[in-house]
């Protein structure tokens, strides 16, 4: 339905505050360097141009495309190129490449100073003295650093946000009441921009194909009793908001995305049973909640797979009647039957049967040759539970902590290459796998765990890309999405490493290590364990061990002392003598 | 869409050849392996032949082995069926499948085999 001023017809659909709120995202997603001021002023101007064609869709302009719109205004930015650099030179294209170009230059680790958290005083005085800009720069504060995030859901985020401070600005312990809900907004903050960032690494690196692909396993699993047309739908339907939103289409995103939130809850009798209580919430908490339904149950009696996928005569003949459709379908039929096995799982699967029809339907007898296909799942379906179980016993005898730092040890050795902060954050995360998986039971193990280890070595691979310095990580990363697990996990050490030169300043440490919080401490430490695998990339476990309780016991003793300073100084000396004697130096 | 279109039957006398051809259309021919099918009036669909992909490996039902031989040109994505010493009990539809799927999905074509 082709509206005469796309702008006005967005501003209509999502109301003035949240048409605000999404241009605001989308500019500080792009600009992710420029001053909280300067997106206001932007997006101010936007909406009294999107007023104006709202009053008036023929007027000057309002025909123009949303990205036309947004790219000329994003280029009136005066320092665009002492900020951006060669970012400006998009400038110079017409659209759609300058948004295009706009796209590639988003950077998944911008240059940006850590967020502090201000005292609970200071926050809520904020708060109230100007509601509206608080919330605002909520908003720019995390698009900025995450220009994927999904910018609908950030709504919910900001929503929620208010509602804390909201609340416990007035409470009698301002702290206890506010201080654990933006921990926890915080966290699920971290995991939504990452779960996103790889479905857009999904759809921008592998294509419309494998994300549908991804969308069909993980959409059977939820609603096993939806008919195989409906999922299609769904899947249709969720690759378009998907694809806009990873596009900087954030206004179309968000629209769609309420479109099918509504289609869904008008048609919860043919998807799932579990939909009632989120279609009853507000739309924003309806649209977040319906992505983080349970599945529902598995239709009884469902007959064998084996029937029409392997023992029918009409298998080639249907495959090659509509390839995508077919292999769909298998994927469908497995996916609503096996609510256990992670979506990467699945999808290797029906990659091993679309393998192998490939071959057998061009041979003479092709049931002769894919009689056994799945016979060729056993083990694909062992590896990743056997490595989960190895993985979860080890978890549970080392606690997250420990857990941690021998997966870091483990990375270390497979990718010395890979920047010391990368590894500390991509292993602490690897490490958490353990607290948020190994606690479930063995039938929700494997899809929490190995799709959870997606998205962080996801994380890892869209670091990587901005400055490669590993082919082995590069070849995991853009071979095949589905088995960048599998590809990681089978990385030994690299032997072609030359340990780094010993750097005593890397190990040299100070009093200030004592006021940080335990999670700061723990980051400290780790580093120092990267830094020292990589100089010694040949350590035993145990000669790691041992130089890092010695640096426990050290951190533990100088914050003890009175003259904090020089007993850092002192003994630090001393630690680094006995780990380079340890290690042999 | 997946199109077969199967030509050259018609009315033969016993001892006499025919040579059918199938045109395929709609999907990559070239990478599938095809069979010949019959059914006789009255009876259920009976698998006559098979080929590979390139051409290489050909099957043959026991009833036809010797008689018929399958070839394929995948530049004209076409599959024959060379008919030779026909007797009346070949009498039959034939249509071409892709793989051994004996479901008919075009209309075939008709061979009768009598004096």
């Known amino acids: 339905d082709a509206h005469k001023s796309e702008v006005a017809h967005r501003f209509k659909d999502l109301g003035e505050e949240n048409f605000k709120a999404l241009v605001l995202i989308a500019f500080a997603q792009y600009l992710q360097q420029c001053p909280f001021e300067d997106h206001v002023k932007l997006v101010n101007e936007v909406t009294e141009f999107a007023k104006t064609c709202v009053a008036d869709e023929s007027a000057e302009n309002c025909d123009k495309s949303l990205h036309t719109l947004f790219g000329d205004k994003l280029c009136t930015v005066a320092t665009l190129r002492e900020t951006y650099g060669e970012m400006a030179d998009c400038c110079a294209k017409q659209e759609p490449e300058r948004n295009e170009c706009f796209l590639q230059h988003k950077d998944d680790n911008p240059n940006l100073p850590r967020l502090v958290r201000p005292e609970v005083d200071v926050m809520c005085t904020a708060f109230h003295d100007n509601e509206e800009t608080f919330l605002k720069k909520y908003l720019y504060e995390i698009a900025r650093r995450h220009p994927y995030f999904y910018a609908p859901e950030l709504l919910f985020f900001a929503k929620r946000y208010k509602a804390a401070f909201t609340e416990c600005c007035q409470a009698a312990d301002k702290a206890a009441c506010l201080l654990p809900k933006l921990d926890e907004l915080r966290d699920e903050g971290k995991a939504s921009s990452a779960k996103q960032r790889l479905k857009c690494a999904s759809l921008q690196k592998f294509g419309e194909r494998a994300f549908k692909a991804w969308a069909v396993a993980r959409l059977s699993q939820r609603f096993p009793k939806a008919e195989f047309a409906e999922v299609s739908k769904l899947v249709t339907d969720l690759t378009k908001v998907h694809t806009e939103c990873c596009h900087g289409d954030l206004l179309e995103c968000a629209d769609d995305r309420a479109d099918l939130a509504k289609y869904i809850c008008e048609n919860q009798d043919s998807i799932s049973s579990k939909l009632k209580e989120c279609c009853e919430k507000p739309l924003l908490e309806k649209s977040h909640c319906i992505a983080e339904v349970e599945n529902d149950e598995m239709p009884a009696d469902l007959p064998s797979l084996a029937a029409d996928f392997v023992e029918s005569k009409d298998v080639c003949k249907n495959y090659a009647e509509a390839k995508d459709v077919f292999l769909g379908m298998f994927l469908y039929e497995y996916a609503r039957r096996h609510p256990d096995y992670s979506v990467v799982l699945l999808l290797r699967l029906a990659k091993t049967y679309e393998t192998t029809l490939e071959k057998c339907c061009a041979a003479a007898d092709p049931h002769e040759c894919y009689a056994k296909v799945f016979d060729e799942f056993k083990p694909l379906v062992e590896e990743p539970q056997n490595l989960i179980k190895q993985n979860c016993e080890l978890f549970e005898q080392l606690g997250e902590y420990k857990f941690q730092n021998a997966l870091l040890v483990r990375y270390t050795k497979k990718v010395p290459q890979v920047s010391t902060p990368t590894l500390v954050e991509v292993s602490r995360n690897l490490g958490k796998v353990g607290s948020k998986c190994c606690k479930h039971p063995e039938a929700k193990r494997m899809p929490c765990a190995e799709d959870y280890l997606s998205v962080v070595l996801n994380q890892l691979c869209v670091l990587h890309e901005k400055t490669p310095v590993s082919d082995r990580v590069t070849k995991c990363c853009t071979e095949s999405l589905v088995n960048r697990r599998p590809c990681f996990s089978a990385l030994e050490v690299d032997e072609t490493y030359v340990p780094k030169e010993f750097n005593a300043e890397t190990f040299t440490f100070h009093a200030d290590i004592c006021t940080l919080s335990e999670k700061e401490r723990q980051i400290k430490k780790q580093t120092a364990l990267v830094e020292l695998v990589k100089h010694k990339p040949k350590a035993t476990k145990e000669q790691l061990k041992a130089v890092m309780d010695d640096f426990a016991a050290f951190v533990e003793k100088c914050c003890k002392a009175d003259d904090k300073e020089t007993c850092f100084a002192e003994e630090g000396k001393k630690l680094v003598a006995a780990s380079q004697a340890a290690l042999g130096l | 869409e997946v199109q077969l279109l199967e030509s050259g039957g018609g009315l033969v006398q016993p001892g006499g050849s025919l040579r059918l051809s199938c045109a395929a259309s709609g999907f990559s021919f070239g990478s599938f392996g095809m069979s010949w099918v019959r059914q006789a009036p009255g009876k259920g669909p009976e698998w006559v032949s098979a080929i590979d992909s390139g051409g290489a490996d050909t099957r043959y039902a026991e009833t036809v082995k010797g008689r018929f031989t399958i070839s394929r040109d995948n530049s004209k994505n076409t599959l024959y069926l060379q008919m030779n010493s026909l007797r009346p009990e070949d009498t039959a539809v034939y249509y071409c499948?892709?793989?051994?799927?004996?479901?008919?999905s075009s209309q075939g074509t008709l061979v009768t085999v009598s004096s």
């Open positions: 499948t892709i793989g051994r799927s004996t479901s008919r």
